[in-house]
Amino acid sequence: CKAMHVAQPAVVLASSRGIASFVCEYASPGKATEVRVTVLRQADSQVTEVCAATYMMGNELTFLDDSICTGTSSGNQVNLTIQGLRAMDTGLYICKVELMYPPPYYLGIGNGTQIYVIDPEPCPDSDF
């Protein structure tokens, strides 16, 4: 396993609709044709997998149908979007990139993006 640099933004604020987007960029050390991208969430020293996708270079990033993530790839950067976020989902979201094929295998893990999610206030009843 060889190490690889990964960059991602330090902080992102989710929209009022609970959507957060960020770029994950990796320093590809060679001609990888198969890449796997995983988003991990770290909160209270617990790390859980949020979503993952494997893609072939030049093709679209495809997550499972029930995934809360969507994304697009362009060269050695991936544009990730996480949907359905609520305040309790606030945490550090880490981008993990693996160059699966051809060998050698490379692994890169970013420093994480702190995503802040604020639940919208309910609209007050209006007396009209």
Epitope: A7, V23, E25, S28, K31, G75, N76, Q77
Partner: nanobody
Framework: EVQLVESGGGLVQPGGSLRLSCAAS????????VGWFRQAPGKEREELSC????????DYPGSVKGRFTITRDNSKNTVYLQMNSLRAEDTAVYYC???????????????????WGQGTQVTVSS
């Protein structure tokens, strides 16, 4: 749309040095990571080096590490490849390529670059 033009190639004796330039027009190069590649007749294109947008991140394959150095001058919209201790097997057409990125990294994979120069010939011979 950024356009790239390589220069600085030519004939050099074994053991000699050359500095190649990759000049950009049409856009500011500071928005782009830049890579250098070469292709010898009958061979696949080979990665040589890359440099991130700010110049703080560079990468080289083992084959040229220590002999080749990549630098950039964003004020001149130019990236340079300094090549020392040249050998006959370094004879090839040398290309630079650019990729618009968000952060400071760069890629050694030709698949990641979407803008290429026309190339400059380097011949190492006595």
């Amino acid at each position: 749309e950024v356009q790239l033009v390589e220069s600085g190639g030519g004939l050099v004796q074994p053991g000699g040095s050359l500095r190649l330039s990759c000049a950009a027009s049409g856009d500011t190069l500071e928005s782009f990571a830049v890579g250098w590649f070469r292709q010898a007749p009958g061979k696949e294109r080979e990665e040589l080096s890359c440099i991130g947008r700010t110049g703080e991140f560079t990468d080289y394959p083992g084959s040229v590490k220590g002999r080749f150095t990549i630098t950039r001058d964003n004020s001149k919209n130019t990236v340079y490849l300094q090549m020392n201790s040249l050998r006959a097997e370094d004879t090839a057409v040398y290309y630079c390529a650019a990729e618009r990125l968000v952060f400071h990294l760069c890629s050694l994979s030709e698949y990641d670059y979407d803008t290429w120069g026309q190339g400059t010939q380097v011949t190492v011979s006595s």
